[in-house]
Interface confidence: low
């Protein structure tokens, strides 16, 4: 007989149906059956620990004690559950040199004051913007690449026409305001937006109206990253700006995150019929 459910580990959970639970009460669902917040499911003679955490896609990266980066703390807990081993948050932001991203799966509040969550001004980054954790001030990064998105003209709530839903999401992020699809096809007055450059946009949220100027001036001062930043950007180019403390990443198409470590599944597709969005 196995000594613990981890002896029956499968990629999605723990299946111990091959053992006779009548001779071993280990396989009854009780509070101790599934550690690390696993959900215990008993179906017939099978007891399975499932780690189906409903993690949101907020990008608040943390570094785990296993040296891996996670998109947020929820994904870290999910990984701990799947691995059935303790993973603590050891620092805010991605690990400096991690072995690989924890599948989007992310400061150690430590032994100091566990009841006091560190407040973060990153909370003001909305509409898909990610917070640049290392900025001295509050900077929101719109790392949205619409270059691979199909042409599917739409009229948005700001009265402007966009080539596709991704561009609406991008505009909403850059302006830090809610912009939604109003109707399929171009707006009646045919106002069209201009698309931004291929890389992520850096703008302080309180300077949204000067976004493009800021971006242009920032790009003028980009220089290649020092050697010790090799690997800083997992799927993209590393650039250092004289007015930023840390390098930034220009992500390849289909990748996002501070270090281009996340696959970007947030491209919006318009579903025919009533105007609804589906995140894929």
């Amino acid at each position: 007989f196995p000594t613990s459910l981890s002896d029956c580990q499968t990629p999605t959970g723990w299946n111990c149906s091959g053992y006779d639970d009548r001779e071993n009460d280990l396989f009854l669902c009780d509070t101790n059956t599934c550690k690390f917040d696993g959900e215990c499911l008993r179906i017939g003679d099978t007891v399975t620990c499932v780690c189906q955490f409903k993690c949101n896609n907020d990008y608040v990266p943390v570094c785990g004690s296993n040296g891996e980066s996670y998109q947020n703390e929820c994904y870290l807990r999910q990984a701990a559950c799947k691995q059935q081993s303790e993973i603590l948050v050891v620092s805010e932001g991605s690990c400096a040199t991690d072995a690989g991203s924890g599948s989007g799966d992310g400061v150690h509040e430590g032994s100091g004051e566990t009841s006091q969550k560190e407040t973060s001004t990153c909370d003001i980054c909305q509409f898909g913007a990610e917070c640049d954790e290392d900025a001295e001030d509050v900077w929101c990064v719109c790392n949205i690449d619409c270059s691979q998105t199909n042409f599917n003209p739409l009229c948005a709530s700001d009265g402007k026409s966009y080539d596709n839903a991704c561009q609406i999401k991008e505009a909403s992020c850059q302006k830090q305001e809610k912009i939604e699809v109003m109707s399929l096809g171009r707006c009646q007055d045919n106002t069209t937006t201009t698309t931004k450059s291929e890389d992520g946009h850096y703008a302080r949220t309180d300077y949204a109206e000067n976004a493009n100027k800021l971006e242009e001036s920032a790009r003028e001062h980009h220089i290649p990253c020092p050697e010790h930043y090799n690997g800083f950007c997992m799927h993209g180019k590393c650039e250092h700006s004289i007015n930023m403390q840390e390098p930034s990443c220009r992500c390849d198409a289909g990748y996002t995150g501070q270090h281009c470590e996340k696959k970007d599944y947030s491209v919006l597709y318009v579903v025919p019929g009533p105007v609804r969005f589906q995140y894929v």
């Epitope: 570094c63 004690s65 296993n66 040296g67 603590l88 050891v90 620092s91 805010e92 932001g93 690990c95 400096a96 040199t97 400061v107 150690h108 509040e109 430590g110 032994s111 100091g112 004051e113 006091q116 560190e118 407040t119 973060s120 001004t121 954790e133 290392d134 900025a135 001295e136 001030d137 010790h228 403390q245 840390e246």
Partner: antibody, heavy 120, light 107 residues
Framework: DVQLQESGPGLVKPSETLSLTCAVS?????????WSWIRQFPGKKLEWMGF???????KYNPSLKNRITISRDTSKNQFSLKLSSVTAADTATYYC?????????????WGQGTLVTVSS | DIQMTQSPSSLSASVGDRVTITCKAS??????VAWYRQKPGKSPKLLIY???NRHTGVPSRFSGSGSGTDFTLTISSLQPEDFADYFC?????????FGGGTKVEIK
Amino acid sequence: DVQLQESGPGLVKPSETLSLTCAVSGYSITSGYYWSWIRQFPGKKLEWMGFISYDGSNKYNPSLKNRITISRDTSKNQFSLKLSSVTAADTATYYCARGLRRGDYSMDYWGQGTLVTVSS
Amino acid sequence: DIQMTQSPSSLSASVGDRVTITCKASQNVVTAVAWYRQKPGKSPKLLIYSASNRHTGVPSRFSGSGSGTDFTLTISSLQPEDFADYFCQQYSSYPFTFGGGTKVEIK
């Protein structure tokens, strides 16, 4: 250039409250970074005491948690340390320092330090 | 609390020597380690952060390495101003803790 300067009494009586202030020039303490107090005992051992963040939130060393308060005066661009119920064991050189950046709490700017002796 | 055990506690060396100081953490601190130099009567100065990144203005003779629990500060060619105390610090979890220090003296 960023400069930090500690000030406060060099002698404090046992059971009283030690009060020190760190005046910061060259950078606004509300604009970014974490602003720490560290002390160094006569045997050169260093102890991180706690910090106040640019947004006003605190983090303290649990060994001092019931005695320590770090606050700030944004109008004067300074932050302060109060340590209550001091004993001779609190005799040390006290430094204020600035954290390097968010998510990296190494300290890149330090004050010159002020020696505080606890004695009656 | 995470203990940072620094060794040696003191060493004697000559100008031009290669010097290595080690720091061992009591548990995994990933790469959240800094190194400082403190000259007599002065405050500590940051040399290395994130285990291996040289701070602005720090000479290239200083280098840091390591991850997890074992970390090293190397001075490739000791200069007269390098005779001082050196401390490591972990900041992977609260409370942040320092090593006991290494005194580098003139031989």
